[in-house]
Amino acid sequence: SGTTNTVAAYNLTWKSTNFKTILEWEPKPVNQVYTVQISTKSGDWKSKCFYTTDTECDLTDEIVKDVKQTYLARVFSYPAGNVESTGSAGEPLYENSPEFTPYLETNLGQPTIQSFEQVGTKVNVTVEDERTLVRRNNTFLSLRDVFGKDLIYTLYYWKSSSSGKKTAKTNTNEFLIDVDKGENYCFSVQAVIPSRTVNRKSTDSPVECMGQEKGEFREI
């Protein structure tokens, strides 16, 4: 069923990183437009991206209201220039998205090493606490604010002169590691949510090496 000359959207896919969340779908419209609706399992439908020719819709503003809720979206298809037209069942053609729970599923963005400081044979490596689009009291919360104890970071580090990697883990955004005196080291970090079954790990941060601008070296 449905309206002549319109086709239902398909391949509805959630694309979400650090809670920036976009619903994508196919096909590129030909003589038709789309409207998206989003709802929690128990809530009312809210319309977004009205009569658009895009095949994506930014739903971030809706999902950040409660990132622990489970959301469902649907994409309606309308004939271009005749958006009042409905299908044979009396309503426009639409397709449902998969369910999406942001807290459990949003991808972890690539972290950044904010700084490293060497004091003698110890190096303190600090990971930037990235801002998310989740708000509380009109301020944006950091990734650590949102995930708290569920978020850990893994540090990979190695001597510039060799390829053998060591790892360290932290429940905060800081590492304190032992290094050999007089050796330069390189660092990369990864965000991890061990309790997840999907999207557990971020991509690795860009590599930062001692002897470059970002760090600070103090011989004690």
């Epitope: 399992k41 622990k68 729970t101 919360l141 949102v146 708290g148 061990p194």
Partner: antibody, heavy 121, light 109 residues
Framework: EVQLQQSGAEVMKPGASVKISCKAS????????IEWVKQAPGQGLEWIGE????????KYNEKFKGRVTFTADTSTNTAYMELSSLRSEDTAVYYC??????????????WGQGTLVTVSS | QAVVTQEPSLTVSPGGTVTLTCRSS?????????ANWVQEKPGHGFKGLIS???NRGPWTTARFSGSILGDKAVLTLWGAHAEDEADYFC?????????FGGGTKLTVL
């Protein structure tokens, strides 16, 4: 309204196993850790462990490891704690709890009413 | 395993201010310990007052405040009421487990 409703009191023999349930309502069950806490008669609180229903990820207090198992049924929004090889010192009230979340927060905001387990021969 | 220590008992006058502390045997308490404060009243069961160091629950009166003071987690009660008489437990997170303190019995007298 968030609610955690626990199963009723149990009287068990030493060596037996007991399975306590905690039925959640009023929120997205899969996204919140369920904490399990023990309060022995006249004693304070002791953390047993936690489960995240959406992934079945668990953490256990070393003291209870090997004797306790957490499970969760997301179709009925119910978490379970099974304690085996019961002994007299397991006599206690067992609670499930959940945090209050508003962007960030972790711990023990909402509590069940408790389940009294008595181990006696 | 870490030991978390609280004052066994404290007394406050009605309208007065009292500070309950939560100390860790492993060193200074930090925000990464996500300090929780839980109230137990006879016949009322348990209720979380503060989680994540300083986040009040929706039912928590503004007379309660959570913070870190020096090396301890602190629950401060301003303008004590008779109904605040209860047992108060703190809990701290240590990387992969929670540890409760022994509790403080607060008397409003």
């Amino acid at each position: 309204e968030v609610q955690l409703q626990q199963s009723g009191a149990e009287v068990m023999k030493p060596g037996a196993s007991v399975k306590i349930s905690c039925k959640a309502s009023g929120y997205t069950f899969s996204s919140y850790w369920i904490e399990w806490v023990k309060q022995a008669p006249g004693q304070g609180l002791e953390w047993i462990g936690e489960i995240l229903p959406g992934s079945a990820s668990t953490k256990y207090n070393e003291k209870f490891k090997g004797r306790v198992t957490f499970t969760a049924d997301t179709s009925t929004n119910t978490a379970y704690m099974e304690l085996s090889s019961l002994r007299s010192e397991d006599t206690a009230v067992y609670y499930c709890a959940r945090d209050y979340y508003y962007g960030s927060s972790y711990g023990f905001a909402y509590w069940g009413q408790g389940t009294l387990v008595t181990v006696s021969s | 395993q870490a030991v978390v220590t609280q004052e066994p008992s404290l007394t406050v006058s009605p309208g007065g201010t009292v500070t309950l502390t939560c100390r860790s045997s492993t060193g200074a308490v930090t925000t990464s310990n996500y300090a929780n404060w839980v109230q137990e009243k006879p016949g009322h069961g348990f209720k979380g007052l503060i989680s994540g160091t300083n986040n009040r629950g929706p039912w928590t009166t503004a007379r309660f405040s959570g913070s870190i003071l020096g090396d301890k987690a602190v629950l401060t009660l301003w303008g004590a009421h008779a109904e605040d008489e209860a047992d108060y437990f703190c809990a701290l997170w240590y990387s992969n487990h929670w540890v409760f303190g022994g509790g403080t019995k607060l008397t409003v007298l």
